[in-house]
């Protein structure tokens, strides 16, 4: 089911590295933290699941990037972009961004110093 995901560039580029990892556990982990008891996310029921399994897989995936520290911001931006359309209102967008910026710390990585999570052309 894996596919080469479009973008070109040498293997050390952040863009390519972010494309090679599975960010879905990170997305679900954050969605669970901000949605708590809400109905459903994707087709995966998150009402009663622990966040720790998503977090473990998420951190493992981020750690797979050759330059985890250097590429962290691009990874966070990609997560934001992937989930932007699912965030129902401005408050949810802000919550998601806040949780997203906490993600590196949860994975014991340093947070990127500057990281603009505004997705161009969208509400986010």
């Amino acid at each position: 089911m894996r596919r080469e995901r479009g973008r070109q560039g040498d293997s050390s580029s952040c863009e390519r590295q972010v494309d090679r990892v599975n960010l879905k556990p990170c997305e679900q982990h954050i969605m669970q933290r901000i949605m708590g008891e809400q109905e459903q996310y994707d087709s995966y029921d998150i009402r009663s699941t622990r966040s720790s399994d998503q977090q473990q897989r998420c951190c493992d995936e981020l750690n797979e990037m050759e330059n985890t520290q250097r590429c962290m911001c691009e990874a966070l931006q990609q997560i934001m972009e992937n989930q932007c359309d699912r965030l129902q209102d401005r408050q949810m967008v802000q919550q998601f961004k806040r949780e997203l910026m906490n993600l590196p710390q949860q994975c014991n990585f340093r947070a990127p110093q500057r990281c603009d999570l505004d997705v161009s052309g969208g509400r986010c």
């Epitope: 879905k24 556990p25 679900q28 994707d42 720790s52 399994d53 998503q54 897989r57 050759e66």
Partner: antibody, heavy 122, light 108 residues
Framework: QQLKESGGGLVKPGGSLKLCCKA?????????MNWVRQAPGKGLEWIGS????????YYADSVKGRFTLSRDNAQSTVCLQLNSLTAADTATYFC????????????????WGPGTLVTVSS | YVMMTQTPSSVSEAVGGTVTIYCRAS???????LVWYQQKPGQPPKLLIY???TRATGVPSRFRGSGSGTQFTLTISGMKAEDVATYYC?????????FGGGTEVVVK
């Protein structure tokens, strides 16, 4: 897309063995690899996993400190070093490729080797 | 450590019948990390269902996965002789990635 284990055999209690799994037909460095064992007539037991870059390695409690996972992406090989073996380690050892669905995220073992039998007996 | 408990350990069903296998997790598991495998004697396991409910490529529609949280189910509707095998659930979200004890399915 194939996996083939090797290195199994008869070993005395307290002894060591090195199992290796050779991959072919796919880009080995793109996949996490796992080892699973099955004692004769018993169920599956997950033993350990190693991520694509070897940065993250996990072990089952039953083998922690005795078994060591490693991989060589250039050789498309993942190995499992078995030390301090006991009769309880007698099993068929399978290596399995872990993939994920890029659209929805789930992980699964989609390619398995035929297995190699390890017998620990004096 | 998440313990996976499968019931029943063995089930006998006539060809054409329906088999239901249950998998209970000791703590909640995200659907994303729940997988079912089929193993026939002398063979390695074969991927059947991932993400709790998505059939793997080539798996017939008579196999259906469902459930969430701590309770998951594999249903075989319209059992065929070729479905005789042992079925295992696995959670692969939190290390150690644990398997259920297996359910042997035989033809009545």
């Amino acid at each position: 897309q194939q996996l083939k284990e090797s290195g199994g055999g008869l070993v005395k209690p307290g002894g060591s063995l090195k199992l290796c799994c050779k991959a072919s037909g796919f880009t080995f460095s793109d996949y996490n690899m796992n080892w699973v064992r099955q004692a004769p007539g018993k169920g599956l037991e997950w033993i350990g996993s190693i991520t694509r870059s070897s940065r993250t390695i996990y072990y089952a409690d039953s083998v922690k400190g005795r078994f060591t996972l490693s991989r060589d992406n250039a050789q498309s090989t993942v190995c499992l070093q078995l030390n301090s073996l006991t009769a309880a380690d007698t099993a068929t050892y399978f290596c399995a490729r872990e993939d994920f669905n890029v659209y929805t995220g789930p992980y699964y073992y989609d390619v398995w080797g035929p297995g190699t039998l390890v017998t620990v007996s004096s | 450590y998440v313990m996976m408990t499968q019931t029943p350990s063995s089930v006998s069903e006539a060809v054409g019948g329906t088999v239901t296998i249950y998998c209970r997790a000791s703590q909640s598991v995200s659907n994303m990390f729940l997988v079912w495998y089929q193993q026939k004697p002398g063979q390695p396991p074969k991927l059947l269902i991932y993400g709790a409910s998505t059939r793997a490529t080539g798996v017939p529609s008579r196999f259906r996965g469902s459930g969430s949280g701590t309770q998951f189910t594999l249903t075989i509707s319209g059992m065929k002789a070729e479905d005789v095998a042992t079925y295992y659930c696995q959670q692969n979200g939190n290390s150690p990635y644990t398997f259920g004890g297996g359910t042997e399915v035989v033809v009545k």
